[in-house]
Amino acid sequence: DAEFRHDSGYEVHHQKLVFFAEDVGSNKGAIIGLMVGGVVIA
């Protein structure tokens, strides 16, 4: 997990999340997302 401090004085926590593609479809492999402040954005 990485933390980034911004000029506004608060911290935003970034965390990489990995899911298996076959859990949401028929493809194989991994899907990588980024969670920022509790929300998956990518």
Epitope: K16, V18, F19, F20, E22, D23, V24, K28, G29
Partner: nanobody
């Protein structure tokens, strides 16, 4: 939930190999993505590798990629971690864990069933 029991740990020299096994009980084994985590002395529990429900897909931590291989045998309700080119920094207790489908497989909180762990020591 499933019950998990690890085996195969031990003392190995740097550069050596070990194969860890995890036996699972419960008829719902193939509903779970399976992972291995490890915890070195004085450190937190960290993700090592995961394998999908079918065994087709795998994912590895950067620190073990190319050295460790995770696999599973759904007919035997078992998961394996083949560890090659072992290093002293691989010394840890290794835990097998089960995560229900659709959850993030690289984070500890996704896993709701854990084994008791097996100790791997890499030392000359």
């Amino acid at each position: 939930e499933v019950q998990l029991l690890e085996s195969g740990g031990g003392l190995v020299q740097p550069g050596g190999s070990l194969r860890l096994s995890c036996a699972a009980s419960g008829r719902t084994f193939n509903n779970y993505n399976m992972g291995w985590f490890r915890q070195a002395p004085g450190k937190g529990r960290e993700f090592v590798a995961a394998v999908s429900r079918s065994g087709v897909s795998t994912y590895y931590a950067d620190s073990v990629k190319g050295r460790f291989t995770i696999s599973r045998d759904n007919a035997k309700n078992a998961v394996y971690l083949q560890m090659n080119s072992l290093r002293p920094e691989d010394t840890a207790i290794y835990y097998c864990a089960a995560a229900y489908r659709g959850t993030a497989i690289n984070v500890r909180r996704s896993y709701d069933s854990w084994g008791q762990g097996t100790l791997v020591t890499v030392s000359s």
